[in-house]
């Protein structure tokens, strides 16, 4: 039942961290003026990853997308290219871990196939909010370095009385919802994995040895561990049983109808 | 068709406070912003304030805080709460519409005079 | 507050010929956002309201006759009228309108040569 929780809580904030990264990744306000100790304007300026918007007092708003690709900067382009990568790994990971959810029942698909798809989508999700907070760091970054940068040389004096106020940006909303949208990403890829350890079936029901050593019956040793899901280290487990029948490394087998007697 | 027509003009004593209004009709003050500018005897357009389309207002910061631009917009009237007026606040008081785009004043009204006068 | 200077105060041109007005904002009205230039122009016949000629710097309001065109970018703006007429005869205001307050020009007044 806590497995099924855990899972079914980590798909949903999962879910709600890649739609906030979608809706962060075309947002338009990923950057705007700074109104902070600058002449009153009438025209407020902020950017996206695609457009660039200006909008009047009047309430008049005019946006320009960017038509073209090489004369942007890299770092934009690199944004734009993490998250986008977020945004397709957590769709995908998303498609996954439907098909994973323990509540729902896809023909006779197991449990240790559920758990594969769960930690395969945990991952993504994981790899898919870390793009995302990447993305938004480095626009963070960049606007912050721009910042001091304009500081510097804020009134560019023109014959002394004549100035130039460059426009400052800082942080916009975007920003904001991209570090939660991809923390709770994170979060919820977290959970799918913590999930994917409880849905992996115990190797402890007592499985049927049957053959003749010596004459007299063979003692089975239990210490199971659970099953390998093929992306944890115990593939290399072996579970020994006296006399030597099998190892886990020959056949790796999970408990089904035909395992009791 | 457009048209602003300013009232509440006349002669009022130094310290004095009088109202203007400004009824507008051809358009909204929902959609668009509406300005105050005056105009002293003999002299140039001076900039009062302005209120937008939202409500949000702005104003002349040399008048000290003594105006106050407000709106009702199911009267389609546009009011100037003038205080503690001085001879100098002597003009006509005109209403202009903002155009929308770029912030210019498209409309104009013909201006109500304000005497201000012992 | 930004202060617009207008150069020269008056002005007289003969009929049909060009007419020049400058305008020199004390900060630059250029939106680095989109790149518009946020300056007005206006003329005003005695007796009667300012009629917008020119927005944006160079964009000249419906109604208005092509003789006159606005230019300019930044700091410096200019008004010609390219063929003066006798109905030309007013005051000519450029004004600020991206720095609250919304500054005038002190004004230009064009007469008949």
């Known amino acids: 039942m806590a497995v099924t929780a855990c899972q079914g809580l980590g798909f949903v904030v999962s879910l709600i961290g890649i739609a906030g990264i979608i809706a962060a990744t075309c947002m338009d306000q990923w950057s705007t003026q700074d109104l902070y100790n600058n002449p009153v304007t009438a025209v407020f300026n902020y950017q996206g990853l695609w457009r660039s918007c200006v909008r009047e007092s009047s309430g008049f708003t005019e946006c320009r997308g960017y038509f073209t690709l090489l004369g942007l900067p890299a770092m934009l382009q690199a944004v734009r290219a993490l998250m986008i990568v977020g945004i397709v790994l957590g769709a995908i990971g998303l498609l996954v871990s439907i098909f994973a959810l323990k509540c729902i029942r896809i023909g006779s698909m197991e449990d240790s196939a559920k758990a594969n798809m769960t930690l395969t989508s945990g991952i993504m999700f994981i790899v898919s909010g870390l793009c995302a907070i990447a993305g938004v760091s480095v626009f963070a970054n960049m606007l912050v370095t721009n910042f001091w940068m304009s500081t510097a040389n804020m009134y560019t004096g023109m014959g002394g009385m004549v100035q130039t106020v460059q426009t400052r940006y800082t942080f916009g909303a975007a920003l904001f919802v991209g570090w939660v949208a991809g923390g709770l990403t994170l979060i919820g890829g977290v959970m799918m994995c913590i999930a994917c350890r409880g849905l992996a079936p115990e190797e402890t029901n007592y499985k049927a040895v049957s053959y003749h050593a010596s004459g007299h019956s063979v003692a089975y040793k239990p210490g199971g561990f659970k099953a390998s899901t093929g992306f944890g280290s115990n593939t290399k487990n072996k579970k020994i049983y006296d006399g030597g029948a099998r190892t886990e490394d020959e056949v790796q087998s999970y408990p089904s109808k035909h395992d009791y007697v | 068709q457009v048209q602003l027509v300013e009232s509440g003009g006349g002669v009022v004593q130094p310290g004095r406070s009088l109202r203007l209004s400004c009824t507008v009709s051809?358009?909204?003050?929902?959609?668009?912003?509406v300005y105050w500018v005056r105009q002293a005897p003999g002299k140039g357009l001076e900039w009062v304030a302005v209120v937008w389309a939202g409500g949000n207002t702005n104003y002349n910061s040399a008048l000290k805080g003594r105006f106050t631009i407000s709106k009702d917009n199911s009267k389609s009237t546009l009011y100037l709460q003038m205080n503690s007026l001085r001879a100098e606040d002597t003009a006509v008081y005109y209403c202009a519409r903002d155009r929308g785009r770029l912030l210019a004043m498209d409309y104009w009204g013909q201006g109500t005079l304000v005497t201000v006068s012992s | 507050d930004i202060v617009m200077t207008q150069s020269p105060d008056s002005l007289a041109v003969s009929l049909g010929e060009r007419a020049t007005i400058n305008c020199k904002s004390s900060q630059s009205l250029l939106n680095s956002g989109n790149q518009k230039n946020y300056l007005a122009w206006y003329q005003q016949k005695p007796g009667q309201p300012p009629k917008l000629l020119i927005y944006g710097a160079s964009t000249r309001e419906s109604g208005v006759p092509d003789r006159f065109s606005g230019s300019g970018s930044g700091t410096d703006f200019t008004l010609t009228i390219s063929s003066l007429q006798a109905e030309d005869v007013a005051v000519y205001y450029c004004q600020n309108d991206y720095f609250f307050p919304f500054t005038f020009g002190q004004g230009t007044k064009v007469e008949i040569k």
């Open positions: 051809g358009f909204t003050l929902t959609s668009y912003g």
